[in-house]
Structures are given as C-alpha cells and as structure tokens.
Amino acid sequence: MAVTACQGLGFVVSLIGIAGIIAATCMDQWSTQDLYNNPVTAVFNYQGLWRSCVRESSGFTECRGYFTLLGLPAMLQAVRALMIVGIVLGAIGLLVSIFALKCIRIGSMEDSAKANMTLTSGIMFIVSGLCAIAGVSVFANMLVTNFWMSTANMYTGMGGMVQTVQTRYTFGAALFVGWVAGGLTLIGGVMMCIACRGLAPEETNYKAVSYHASGHSVAYKPGGFKASTGFGSNTKNKKIYDGGARTEDEVQSYPSKHDYV
C-alpha cells in the first residue's frame, strides 16, 4: 500500500512539475523591466524565451517573436534547449510511469517490469527537473550579469549630451514557476525511484509451496510477513480453492474500490 501511495504521489507531483515546466517555457515573463528607477512607467517591457512584449499604459500589449535563430544569444539558445529537453524527458517519463503504476494492470505484466519502468520514469523525471532548474538558473545568471552591467553604465549617449535611460531587466514570474516546477519534477522522480525499490522482487526469493493441512484449508507461504506486505512479490502461487486463503497476487486480481486512489 505504501509503495502504491509513494508511486502514485510521485506520479502526481511529477505531472504537476512537468505542467509547470511547460507553462514556464511558454510564459513571456522570463525577464521583466526593473521599475526601481521609474515605478510609474507608461511603457512596460518583458521578455520570454520566444518573444518580447511591450505593455502600454493604454492597455495595449504588443508582442514580437524572435524570428531569427542565428542572431539570438547562445545562452538563450541553451536555455531553450534545456527546457525543451526537460519537457521531452518529462513527457516520456509520464508515459512510461502511467504503465508502471501499480494500480493499473496491463495484461500479465510482471512486477519486476513495473519496477524497471518506475525506475526509468523516476530517472527521467529527475533529469527533467534538473534540466528545468539548470535552464532557469542559467537565464537568471544571465539577467543578474546584464543587470549589473547596465547599472554600471545607467546613462549612455553621445558624449553625455543625450540622456538615454537604459532599460534594466529583473527576474520574471516564469523563473519562479520554472524553479518550483523543476523542484517538483525532481521530487516526483525521487519518489518514483523510492517506490521502485518496493516494487522490485527480492534477490533471494523462495518458490512458494502450498501445503494441504488436514481439516483446514490454509495456503502456507515461506517468507513470513513478506507475502502480506508490498515488499515481496510472488506471482507463482496458485489458489487452493475459493474458501481458502488467497495469496497476495490473487487479492490484487480482484480489485476492490480501495485499490484505486
């Protein structure tokens, strides 16, 4: 039960995280105009990975895509790549983890196969989360560098005659969404990996033997409590008859309403 909960929670957390990574990647507010010097600006600038926008006091917002590929800074390209890799890995991870979920049965899939799939998806989520965190952090570092550079020469112009206030940019909402989303995906991935340990069959797993006890219908299973916990799996046990005790596998074969979260 604990394994199913851990796996299910890991899946949900990762799902939220990947949705957040997608949202952050699509958002326009990766960097926003710093309003420290002019808090009542009539023109507000903000930029995303794919386009830059200008919101006017009048209520009009104009966005223009970056229609060049070669003309863009290498760092921006790197951030784009990291975020896309994160989304792709996360999406594949989600697909794999759906089939790996303990509460979903697909044919006669072995628990060992589910364990492997859970581990694979977990690793994918971890890498996806790291990609998102790395991408956002690289962009944030780029912003900090540019911020202090533009602060150093706040006013530029022709021999100091023309006063041109340089627009400085600070952290936008997308950065925080990206950090949180990356963190959630990472946590979800770790949870999937932890759940995988519980799903994996023991190395020294004995063959279960059924004994007929006289006057009683009892199935005896070597391995003690492992048969009734989620940590040892034995798919080879056959039931004696309906009135007798069932193995763990058989209990799962007839799901009750409590088996679904």
Partner: antibody, heavy 118, light 113 residues
Framework: EVQLLESGGGLVQPGGSLRLSCAAS????????MSWVRQAPGKGLEWVST????????YYPDSVKGRFTISRDNSKNTLYLQMNSLRAEDTAVYYC???????????WGQGTLVTVSS | DIVMTQSPDSLAVSLGERATINCKSS????????????LTWYQQKPGQPPKLLIY???TRESGVPDRFSGSGSGTDFTLTISSLQAEDVAVYYC?????????FGGGTKLEIK
C-alpha cells in the same frame, strides 16, 4: 464613432470641490485606459490624470496629486474626476480622452469649463 | 519629469509650402523593448478639442491626410506638413507618452503667410 461627453463643470470658490463626469459610448469602455487633460484659457495642454482599464492604477502630476482623484465606473461607461481644494490656477477647460496605441490620446471630448474664482 | 520643448512658438507658411515643427525632449523617448519612440503629435483648431495626428513619432492616425508626417528618434522629433492647406491653420502640440507624468510641448501656432 467614439463619443466622449464631459459634464459637471462650473463656477466654484477657491478651496471648494467639484466632480466632473465623462460619459463614453461607441467603444468597449472597460478595455481602455482613460485620461483627463486640461487647458487654461489661452494656454497650452496639461495632463491631469490617467486611470488604467482595470481601475488598478492611477497616475497624477505633482500639481494635482492629493487634491484630484480619478475613478471610473465600467458598468456605467463613465469616467470621473473628483477635484478638491480647488485653486485659481485650476481654472481651465477639462477634457477627457481615450488612450490608444502608443499611449496616444486618440479621442477627446468637447471639454467642460471649470472656473475657480471668489 | 521629461521636459518637452517645441520650436518655433509660431510659424507662418504660404499655402502649398512645407511647414516644419520641431520638438525636443529632455530624455530619450525611445523604448528599447520595441524600438518605438513614444512621442505623439496633436492638432488643435480654435474652439475645438485637440485631435491626434501621429503616434509612435511617425505612425499616422487613421483618417489623417498623408501630407502630415512625423520623424525623429530619441530626443529630437519633427512634424512636417508637406503642402500647407488652409484647414491646417491650428496649434500643434507634441507630447511625451513614454513615462509619467505625461508632458506636452508649449505648442506651435501655424498660420498662413
């Protein structure tokens, strides 16, 4: 055709109050920022206030800050300017204007005259 | 605050001739985000409210005759009437639409010579 009609102007004593209204029609009022601009007799234009489309932001020059309050009622398609502690130098024709692209005041009302005199 | 300075204060031009009005701002009105200059030109005829002519320094408002054109960038701007018509007699104002407080130039009175 966009229409803006100011009202509420008149003669008021120094230190008195007045509330101007601007009724808007033929456009989606709630989507646009609106401004008040004044023009003293024989003088140039002076911006008085701007309010954002969602009522969240209001802007004033130092000359009227703390005395004038801009507001809007999107359900009534009406812009207001509450003027308190009026001075002789506030005497002017007050225009309301709809802001468009480039923060330009693309449509203006005919104006209402406010005279502050004892 | 951004100070807008217009020149000349008044201008007399013959019908059909070119009229040029200048406007200078104390700070740049160029927005780096979209590379547009937030300068607006208005025309005010006697007894009438102002009328928008040009925004973004050079974009003509719809319905404005093409003899009106705006140019300039940063701090120096020009309104040009290529061929003066009798109906162009008015006072022309430039306005900073880049940052609050919005400020207007003192106006240029255009007359027929």
């Amino acid at each position: 055709e966009v229409q803006l009609l100011e009202s509420g102007g008149g003669l008021v004593q120094p230190g008195g109050s007045l509330r101007l209204s601007c009724a808007a029609s033929e456009f989606t009022f709630s989507n646009y920022a609106m401004s008040w601009v004044r023009q003293a007799p024989g003088k140039g234009l002076e911006w008085v206030s701007t309010i954002s489309s969602g009522r969240s932001s209001t802007y004033y020059p130092d000359s009227v800050k703390g005395r004038f309050t801009i507001s809007r009622d999107n359900s009534k398609n009406t812009l207001y300017l509450q003027m308190n502690s009026l001075r002789a130098e506030d005497t002017a024709v007050y225009y309301c204007a709809k802001l468009g692209r480039g923060n330009a005041m693309e449509y203006w009302g005919q104006g209402t005259l406010v005279t502050v005199s004892s | 605050d951004i100070v807008m300075t217009q020149s000349p204060d008044s201008l007399a031009v013959s019908l059909g001739e070119r009229a040029t009005i200048n406007c200078k701002s104390s700070q740049s009105l160029l927005n780096s985000g979209n590379q547009k200059n937030y300068l607006t030109w208005y025309q005010q005829k006697p007894g009438q409210p102002p009328k928008l002519l040009i925004y973004w320094a050079s974009t003509r408002e719809s319905g404005v005759p093409d003899r009106f054109s705006g140019s300039g960038s940063g701090t120096d701007f020009t309104l040009t009437i290529s061929s003066l018509q009798a109906e162009d007699v008015a006072v022309y104002y430039c306005q900073n639409a880049y940052s609050y407080p919005f400020t207007f130039g003192g106006g240029t009175k255009l007359e027929i010579k």
